[in-house]
């Protein structure tokens, strides 16, 4: 309740997160023209990426373009990229939608289609749909530990969400354990009224709100966080221009003295931790 006699001050906060969990991924792997089922294990280093600010990212799906080399090749025949003669291809042109610099030649992409040749990482990335169901759908069972230190400088008061009495094996529950700072990712989505399995395919942005309403008067002291969750990106993927949340990164290696890379288009959930609240003292 609003105590008018108190001097209020906004919270100053720092956040640190630690994600834990292992995922087993089964996907089709093509080697030498033969497609077979491949199994791989993903640990924290494989699916989380350091982000700036109060955010962390968990990869839930991906599309790989393996063995790319910097050379010449036909560009992927996306809409509007096909050609019938060299006139359609402009030497030195860098189309923002393209993956390379045009050489000026119209070359065969396959049996029926021709596209402009480009100097690029080849073969150029295909426009593939994100796998469904998501490859790391088991990320639903990963957990994140959120460490949140807060400070009210005007009141010379510092505290944190993790208490010495807390059990390291607890899991947050709105009713049974609302002060536990270890959250199961699937539970965060459930609390926000979202379907993890569905969002995991294209990715998305989830907000974890930590609200501190602190009464710092000694006779009625209370300063504990309240957690709530809501989806922050546009959930109507059919209507939104670029649905979900994804980015590309590459793993570089050398093979027979040729520099190669595996390009990975990573889809996943970016979790934004939003800390707000006030501290009041007479």
């Amino acid at each position: 309740s609003d105590k008018l006699y108190q001097r209020k001050e906004p919270v100053i906060s720092s956040v640190h997160t630690k994600v834990k969990g292992i995922a087993e991924v089964t996907e089709n792997v093509t080697e030498g023209g033969v497609t077979k089922l491949g199994h791989s294990i993903f640990d924290t280093a494989d699916y989380t990426f350091p982000l700036q600010g109060n955010s962390f990212f968990v990869m839930t799906n991906y599309v790989k373009s393996e063995g790319q080399v910097q050379t010449l090749c036909p560009e992927y025949p996306r809409r509007g990229a096909q050609c019938s003669s060299d006139r359609r291809c402009k030497k030195g042109w860098m189309d923002p939608q393209s993956k390379g610099i045009q050489t000026g030649r119209c070359v065969p992409y396959d049996k029926t289609r021709k596209t402009c040749e480009v100097s690029a990482w080849c073969p150029t990335e295909e426009e593939k749909e994100a796998p469904r169901p998501a490859l790391l759908r088991s990320a639903e069972n990963f957990t994140v530990l959120i460490k949140n230190n807060i400070h009210f400088p005007g009141h010379n008061y510092t505290t944190r969400n993790i208490l010495p009495t807390m059990n390291g094996s607890c899991t947050f529950h709105k009713t049974w354990d609302p002060q536990c700072s270890i959250f199961r990712l699937g539970d965060i989505f459930q609390e926000a009224g979202e379907n993890f399995t569905e969002v995991a395919v294209q990715g998305g942005i989830m907000g974890i709100e930590i609200y501190w309403d602190c009464n710092l008067d000694s006779w009625s002291h209370h300063c504990r966080p309240r957690y709530s969750f809501r989806r922050l990106d546009d959930k109507n993927t059919d209507e939104s221009f670029v649905p979900g949340y994804n980015f590309r990164y590459a793993k570089y290696y050398k093979e027979n003295n040729v520099e190669k890379r595996t390009l990975i288009k990573a889809f996943g959930i970016r979790f934004d931790i939003l800390v707000f609240g006030t501290g009041g003292k007479f």
Epitope: G33, G67, V69, T71, L72, C73, P74, R105, V107, P108, Y109, D110, K111, E117, C122, P123, V258
Partner: nanobody, 115 residues
Framework: EVQLVESGGGLVQAGGSLRLSCAAS?????MGWFRQAPGKEREFVAG????????RYADSVKGRFTISRDNAKNAVSLQMSGLKPEDTAIYYC???????????WGQGTQVTVSS
């Protein structure tokens, strides 16, 4: 799927020459040659992009082998000179999306270099 037919293999003396040819059932951006010696892995020999641009050679054959393309015939040939016994292998024609990337291979033609 692209069909590839190789020809021109045979027995030749060290220092001699041989010309391998390959015809593809459809046009393709890159065509190249690989080889596999007994008990060894298949290795890249030479590759050519559309109209012969770019070309790429394995270090072991540079200056001795020349690859050439005939786009009109969907064909590629490999002129091999200064042959050595270590060039003995089954030579495979291949097609792909760049001079580094190949998806389809022919049945192969045997090249034997005697000393």
């Amino acid at each position: 799927e692209v069909q590839l037919v190789e020809s021109g293999g045979g027995l030749v003396q060290a220092g001699g020459s041989l010309r391998l040819s390959c015809a593809a059932s459809e046009r393709t951006y890159s065509m190249g040659w690989f080889r596999q010696a007994p008990g060894k892995e298949r290795e890249f020999v030479a590759g050519s992009g559309w109209d012969g641009i770019p070309t790429r050679y394995a270090d072991s054959v540079k200056g001795r082998f020349t690859i050439s393309r005939d786009n009109a015939k969907n064909a590629v040939s490999l002129q091999m000179s200064g042959l050595k016994p270590e060039d003995t292998a089954i030579y495979y024609c291949a097609t792909g999306t760049s001079v580094y990337h190949y998806q389809y291979w022919g049945q192969g033609t045997q090249v034997t270099v005697s000393s």
